[in-house]
């Protein structure tokens, strides 16, 4: 039961995380105009990965897409790539994990296959989360660098009298959404990997128990042949005790005192 819960929770957490990564990637508020210590503006600037926007005090908002690809900073391109890779990996991970869920039965899929898929999706979620965190962190670093550079030459004199105020940008809401979403996806991935360990049956070779029947000097090994559902493909049949009808979770538990007559 604990395995199912861990797997289900991991899936849900990752789903929320990936939704957050998608939202962050699409958001326009990756960087917002720094209002601290600035003249009061009737125009509020903010920028995303795909376009930059202005909210006028008149209430109107206007956005302009970055129509150039080559003219964009390499760092911005890198952030875009990281976020997209994160989304793609996360989406594939979600797809794989749906089929891996213990509560969903697809044909005669064995536990070993589900365990494999759970681990695969878990790894994908971890990488997806790391991509998102890396992308957001790279952008944040870029902002910090630019912020202090623009602070250093906040007012660049032009012809003595004219001043050109550089618009300084600070962290936007999308960065926090991205960090949290990346973290959730990462946690979800770890949970999936943990669940995978529980899904894989223990390949325990139980020692033969000798029963000395009266009048007969023969050793008896109980239990019929049963195909192994161990992690990975295993063609060898192992003799394991079939203790009658039990729940799926109980099948994977260690032998108890009732397993031996």
């Amino acid at each position: 039961m604990a395995v199912t819960a861990c797997q289900g929770l991991g899936f849900v957490v990752s789903l929320i995380g990936i939704a957050g990564i998608i939202a962050a990637t699409c958001m326009d508020q990756w960087s917002t105009q720094d209002l601290y210590n600035n003249p009061v503006t009737a125009v509020f600037n903010y920028q995303g990965l795909w376009r930059s926007c202005v909210r006028e005090s008149s209430g109107f908002t206007e956005c302009r897409g970055y129509f150039t690809l080559l003219g964009l900073p390499a760092m911005l391109q890198a952030v875009r790539a990281l976020m997209i890779v994160g989304i793609v990996l996360g989406a594939i991970g979600l797809l794989v994990s749906i089929f891996a869920l213990k509560c969903i039965r697809i044909g005669s899929m064995e536990d070993s296959a589900k365990a494999n898929m759970t681990l695969t999706s878990g790894i994908m979620f971890i990488v997806s989360g790391l991509c998102a965190i890396a992308g957001v962190s790279v952008f944040a670093n870029m902002l910090v660098t630019n912020f202090w550079m623009s602070t250093a030459n906040m007012y660049t004199g032009m012809g003595g009298m004219v001043q050109t105020v550089q618009t300084r940008y600070t962290f936007g809401a999308a960065l926090f959404v991205g960090w949290v979403a990346g973290g959730l996806t990462l946690i979800g991935g770890v949970m999936m990997c943990i669940a995978c360990r529980g899904l894989a049956p223990e390949e325990t070779n139980y020692k033969a128990v000798s029963y000395h029947a009266s009048g007969h000097s023969v050793a008896y090994k109980p239990g019929g042949f049963k195909a192994s559902t161990g992690f990975g493909s295993n063609t060898k049949n192992k003799k394991i005790y079939d203790g009658g009808a039990r729940t799926e979770d109980e099948v994977q538990s260690y032998p108890s005192k009732h397993d031996y007559v």
């Epitope: 503006t41 008149s58 956005c63 302009r64 050109t164």
Partner: antibody, heavy 117, light 113 residues
Framework: EVQLVESGGGLVQPGGSLRLSCAGS????????MSWVRQAPGKGLEWVSS???????YYLDSVKGRFTISRDNAKNTLYLQMSSLRAEDTAVYYC???????????WGQGTLVTVSS | DIVMTQSPDSLAVSLGERATINCKSS????????????LTWYQQKPGQPPKKLIY???TRESGVPDRFSGSGSGTDFTLTISSLQAEDLAVYYC?????????FGQGTKLEIK
């Protein structure tokens, strides 16, 4: 047709108070950022105050603390409450709507405020 | 506060001739977000409220004759009337809409030569 009609102007003594009104027809004032602009006799235009979405207000430094911009959505009216009036506040006061580019596109005909003893 | 300086203070031009009014801002009015300049040109005739001609430095208001055009970016802007008509005689103001307090130029009076 959009119309803005100012009222409430008149002669007032220095230190006195006055409330200007701007009634809108063909326009819902609450959905737009609105401004007051004044023009002293024979002089240029001077922005006085603005009210934007969320009721955020902005004022010219020389009127801060003395003037208050507000609006009554039910009456579709913009107000400028003026107190501690000075001789230099004498002007024609216009109300105007802020639109694209923060530009003032619709203006009222103006109301004259004279501060004199 | 942003200082808006218009030149000349008055301008006498013959009918049918080109009229050019300049406006200089003490700070850049160019928004990095949408690459637009927050400058507006108004026309005011005696006894009337101002009328918006040009916004975003170069976008003509609907209904404004195409002989009126705006240009410039950053701190230097120009209003051009390509062929002056009698009804164009008025005072012209530039206004910056980027920073509070919103400020106007002192005005340029356009007269017939």
């Amino acid at each position: 047709e959009v119309q803005l009609v100012e009222s409430g102007g008149g002669l007032v003594q220095p230190g006195g108070s006055l409330r200007l009104s701007c009634a809108g027809s063909g326009i819902t004032l609450s959905t737009y950022a609105m401004s007051w602009v004044r023009q002293a006799p024979g002089k240029g235009l001077e922005w006085v105050s603005s009210i934007i979405s969320g009721g955020i207000t902005y004022y010219l430094d020389s009127v801060k603390g003395r003037f208050t911009i507000s609006r009554d959505n039910a009456k579709n009216t913009l107000y400028l409450q003026m107190s501690s009036l000075r001789a230099e506040d004498t002007a024609v006061y216009y109300c105007a709507r802020k639109y694209h580019g923060n530009a003032l596109d619709y203006w009222g005909q103006g109301t004259l405020v004279t501060v004199s003893s | 506060d942003i200082v808006m300086t218009q030149s000349p203070d008055s301008l006498a031009v013959s009918l049918g001739e080109r009229a050019t009014i300049n406006c200089k801002s003490s700070q850049s009015l160019l928004s990095s977000g949408n690459q637009r300049n927050y400058l507006t040109w108004y026309q005011q005739k005696p006894g009337q409220p101002p009328k918006k001609l040009i916004y975003w430095a170069s976008t003509r208001e609907s209904g404004v004759p195409d002989r009126f055009s705006g240009s410039g970016s950053g701190t230097d802007f120009t209003l051009t009337i390509s062929s002056l008509q009698a009804e164009d005689l008025a005072v012209y103001y530039c206004q910056q809409n980027y920073f509070y307090p919103l400020t106007f130029g002192q005005g340029t009076k356009l007269e017939i030569k």
